[in-house]
Interface confidence: low
Amino acid sequence: KIDACKRGDVTVKPSHVILLGSTVNITCSLKPRQGCFHYSRRNKLILYKFDRRINFHHGHSLNSQVTGLPLGTTLFVCKLACINSDEIQICGAEIFVGVAPEQPQNLSCIQKGEQGTVACTWERGRDTHLYTEYTLQLSGPKNLTWQKQCKDIYCDYLDFGINLTPESPESNFTAKVTAVNSLGSSSSLPSTFTFLDIVRPLPPWDIRIKFQKASVSRCTLYWRDEGLVLLNRLRYRPSNSRLWNMVNVTKAKGRHDLLDLKPFTEYEFQISSKLHLYKGSWSDWSESLRAQTPEEEPTGMLDVWYMKRHIDYSRQQISLFWKNLSVSEARGKILHYQVTLQELTGGKAMTQNITGHTSWTTVIPRTGNWAVAVSAANSKGSSLPTRINIMNLCEAGLLAPRQVSANSEGMDNILVTWQPPRKDPSAVQEYVVEWRELHPGGDTQVPLNWLRSRPYNVSALISENIKSYICYEIRVYALSGDQGGCSSILGNSKHKAPLSGPHINAITEEKGSILISWNSIPVQEQMGCLLHYRIYWKERDSNSQPQLCEIPYRVSQNSHPINSLQPRVTYVLWMTALTAAGESSHGNEREFCLQGKAN
């Protein structure tokens, strides 16, 4: 009812609650002496559906038949209109349109944990749009019954608040839910279950991992579970992996040994529990435990290479280089590398630990037979040493690979190809392709890169530490026992014309010819491998074409003679440099006048 309805009434037939599609009769009637003050026939009763007029009538009452009302609540209000006054509200009524409840479907019950309470869920079916009461009933052994009601319009869950205990785990319980509203009622099919069917254990907690004697091979995972848990499943994976390893265990009693973990790896572990082999459901997965496995001693061997440099008649410099072990080989944080240098005939040995570097340089006599061994050490031990006999890698000319070429192969890659050496190619045990940035000074601090290639290969793609517009000195070594032969070439992955020409720093006269000296172009301006230098000259005030002399580029060369200048003529000279992509702009100009006699 709306308002106090002092002036009249609104009645609804057959009911305020109707089935969708039904018709209702609404009557609005004034109480005695509640009409317009002067003349009752002037009473004008108006019926509103929400704010819209749907009917009116002069007199003491109004009847209206209404159809097609939508699902939900519709408000009707009756008002009185008298001459020269505002409409007065008489009374109103709400009409509720809905449907009878559908049969609840998929009733299922669960008890979370042994100490939890039984709760059931179901699917309500379509919305009734009416006040609907749901009653959940549970019956058990010895005629025990429990009942719980819920009056929420959207009710699809109820907790009985009772705890099933495992005293008789095979006893049957039956649950049923009934939905009731003004238009009808409907009950679900009964759901029958035992304690073991519906108890879903709590996920395991307090997960810990223990590495006996700090060893990955003796690793035990511990956790706590509810008392009745029979089965567990464990899943674990390295933290950077998406794939889980899965293990099912029975009667684990809160511990399990893991045998296949990798050392020095962070793993994520989770555990789930179940009460019975084939009844009931698995618990949720536990919270993740993240743990790093201990180190183990390194496996594998270092890839070691070396470079020899002549110092003087009695001494040579040996530079050793090695590559980091892979993560799976290092099996821990490498703390240092151990380098042992030994003179094989005299038995003299020297050992040094290297930290923070993957190279080592020392000076040794040029006489004697020398060998080195390099190993990597972590907190648990050392890798097997890599042993190398120091030899002259390019001594055997017949072992030198032939027709070495280096070509750009896409972005920052160089394809190196060669032909086997003339000497019996089957004698080659392996090829080593070595590359380093070309520095005119032959700087030994420049990082060295290398890769090993099987003896049947005649090409290698080098991509590690290759930069565009940088020239690399590339060597291919053929190794056979204690002998080696090598060939070298210059190569770049990308080139363009040099950014500047050489700077002439001096012109000197020598026996009727001149010697021009220049400074190398800075490496960052060479823009790839230089092929040639050009020296240009012309008479100072002449408009004639300059003459030129083209010199093949050699790393160490920075002077060249010219003997075709006329005496007592002033010349202007300059230089350019060329890569495969073109010629640089010219460097500085120098004037020079040859003083001597003509040849």
């Epitope: 307090d206 962070e266 993740s288």
Partner: nanobody, 125 residues
Framework: QVQLVESGGGLVQAGGSLRLSCAAS????????MGWFRQAPGKEREFVSA????????YYVESVEGRFTISRDNAKNTVYLQMNSLKPEDTAVYYC??????????????????WGQGTQVTVSS
């Protein structure tokens, strides 16, 4: 065992920021989980934040979530706590701690083996 030394504490206005550092000695620093705890006058020591050995997992107490960030640099053997939008209730002595226990229960002080001396943080209103 590792030795821990905290620094970076001081006096700051509410809404301001501080960055605490904890330097560790000992070459096995990278295998420790590290945590920050704090203790206000007359109160128990409480967990603030923790970070796993490689920085892959980070944990925060609810009251500092979104304001504090924990990080570590294993190359420098240092763990950091960046504290933004500081409030007067953050006033406390902040302690750095190291744990070799592999567990999610990083909020429990007894899981930590080694502790620093602490650094005072005062936030004025």
């Amino acid at each position: 065992q590792v030795q821990l030394v905290e620094s970076g504490g001081g006096l700051v206005q509410a809404g301001g920021s501080l960055r605490l550092s904890c330097a560790a000695s000992g070459r096995t620093f990278s295998s420790y989980a590290m945590g920050w705890f704090r203790q206000a006058p007359g109160k128990e020591r409480e967990f603030v934040s923790a970070i796993s050995w490689n920085g892959g997992s980070r944990y925060y107490v609810e009251s500092v979530e979104g304001r504090f960030t924990i990080s570590r640099d294993n190359a420098k053997n240092t763990v950091y706590l960046q504290m933004n939008s500081l409030k007067p209730e953050d006033t406390a002595v902040y302690y750095c701690a190291a744990s070799r226990i592999y567990t999610n229960y990083v909020a429990r002080s007894y899981e930590y083996d080694d502790w620093g001396q602490g650094t005072q943080v005062t936030v004025s209103s």
